[in-house]
C-alpha cells in the first residue's frame, strides 16, 4: 500500500468525520451524539488504515478542545466509547435514537 493511498483514505475519512459532526449539529436531536460519533468513526475506518488514523486524530483533537472548554468527563468517556465502537467496525445504529430522521 502506498503512502498516497493512505493519504487519500485519511482525506476521505476526515470528510466522513466532518459530515457526521455537521449532521449532528443540523439534526440537533436529543440523545443522538453517540450515534453521530460512532457513525463518523465507522465511515472513516471503513476507508482503510488512513481513514481510521484520521478518525483517531480528529476525535482526539476534538476531545482535547472540549476538555479545555470544560466538557464533562462523563460525557467525554461516553463519546470516546462511541468513537471506538465505530472505529472497530461495530454498527453505529446501536446508538441511534428512536425517530431520528432517516436522512441521517
Amino acid at each position: 500500500r502506498s503512502f498516497f493511498s493512505f493519504l487519500g483514505e485519511a482525506f476521505d475519512g476526515a470528510r466522513d468525520m466532518w459530515r457526521a459532526y455537521s449532521d449532528m449539529r443540523e439534526a440537533n436531536y436529543i440523545g443522538s451524539d453517540k450515534y453521530f460519533h460512532a457513525r463518523g468513526n465507522y465511515d472513516a475506518a471503513k476507508r482503510g488504515p488512513g481513514g481510521a488514523w484520521a478518525a483517531e486524530v480528529i476525535t482526539d483533537a476534538r476531545e482535547n478542545i472540549q476538555r479545555f472548554f470544560g466538557h464533562g468527563a462523563e460525557d467525554s468517556l461516553a463519546d470516546q466509547a462511541a468513537n471506538e465502537w465505530g472505529r472497530s467496525g461495530k454498527d453505529p445504529n446501536h446508538f441511534r435514537p428512536a425517530g431520528l430522521p432517516e436522512k441521517y
Epitope: 454498527d91 446501536h94 428512536a98
Partner: antibody, heavy 121, light 107 residues
Framework: QVQLQQSGAELVRPGVSVKISCKGS????????MHWVKQSHAKSLEWIGV????????SYNQKFKGKATMTEDKSSSTVYMELARLTSEDSAIYYC??????????????WGQGTLVTVSA | DIQMTQSPASLSASVGETVTITCRAS??????LAWYQQKQGKSPQLLVY???TLAEGVPSRFSGSGSGTQFSLKINSLQPEDFGSYYC?????????FGTGTKLELK
C-alpha cells in the same frame, strides 16, 4: 410501578384501518421509547417499530412501512398505532413494550397485556 | 436483517431437570442478546439481557451465556412455573429481531 395498559380487542373487516392504544404509567413517559411487537402463529414475534416519546417521531421496521403508523399524546402518556388496509395476515396480538432507553435498540422489561386484532369478513 | 435461530423448537422435561436452549445469530451481535419467557395467553417476560444479566426478580436458576453468534439459556432444577415458550432477541442494531421460539413442555 411501571404499567402499560392497552386498548381492547378489535374485530375488523378486510381493507379498513384500526387504531390501538397503549397508556404508560408509573414512570416519566418521555424518558423511554415505546415499541410495538406483533405476535402471530405464523411468524412468532416481530418488531414493528418504535416511537420517540419526547419528539413524537417514529422509526419502523422496513417490513411494516406503509402498514403501521405510530403517534403519541404526551398529555395522556399514550401511544397509538394505526394499521392500514388490513388483511387476514394482520390478524395477530399486538404488544406495546417500553424500551430500556430512548434508543431504537433495546430489550423490553415492560410489556402491555396485548391487543388482539382479528381481520374477518 | 439479523436472523435468530433457536433450537430445539420444542422439548419435554420433568420438574427438577436441567435444560439448555440455544440461540444462533446470523452475524456477530457481541453480547447484545435478551431472553424472554412467555406463558399461554400472557405477555412475554424479560429473563436476561446483555446475554447474561438477569432481569429484576428473575430466579437464579436461570442463567444466560454466550457471545458473538452462539448463545444459551440454562434453567437449573426446573420448576412447574417454568413451562412455556422461550424467545431470544438481539438488541444490537436495527431492526430488532426475535428467535423462532422454543416450547418447553412437561414430560
Amino acid at each position: 410501578q411501571v404499567q402499560l395498559q392497552q386498548s381492547g380487542a378489535e374485530l375488523v373487516r378486510p381493507g379498513v384501518s384500526v387504531k390501538i392504544s397503549c397508556k404508560g404509567s408509573g414512570y416519566t413517559f418521555t424518558d423511554y421509547a415505546m415499541h410495538w411487537v406483533k405476535q402471530s402463529h405464523a411468524k412468532s414475534l416481530e418488531w414493528i417499530g418504535v416511537i420517540n416519546t419526547y419528539y413524537g417521531d417514529a422509526s419502523y421496521n422496513q417490513k411494516f412501512k406503509g402498514k403501521a403508523t405510530m403517534t403519541e399524546d404526551k398529555s395522556s402518556s399514550t401511544v397509538y398505532m394505526e394499521l392500514a388496509r388490513l388483511t387476514s395476515e394482520d390478524s395477530a396480538i399486538y404488544y406495546c413494550a417500553r424500551g430500556s432507553s430512548i434508543m431504537i435498540t433495546s430489550w423490553f422489561a415492560y410489556w402491555g397485556q396485548g391487543t388482539l386484532v382479528t381481520v374477518s369478513a | 436483517d439479523i436472523q435468530m435461530t433457536q433450537s430445539p423448537a420444542s422439548l419435554s422435561a420433568s420438574v427438577g431437570e436441567t435444560v439448555t436452549i440455544t440461540c444462533r445469530a446470523s452475524e456477530n451481535i457481541y453480547s447484545y442478546l435478551a431472553w424472554y419467557q412467555q406463558k399461554q395467553g400472557k405477555s412475554p417476560q424479560l429473563l436476561v439481557y446483555n446475554a447474561k444479566t438477569l432481569a429484576e426478580g428473575v430466579p437464579s436458576r436461570f442463567s444466560g451465556s454466550g457471545s458473538g453468534t452462539q448463545f444459551s439459556l440454562k434453567i437449573n432444577s426446573l420448576q412447574p412455573e417454568d413451562f412455556g415458550s422461550y424467545y431470544c432477541q438481539h438488541h444490537y442494531g436495527t431492526p430488532i429481531t426475535f428467535g423462532t421460539g422454543t416450547k418447553l413442555e412437561l414430560k
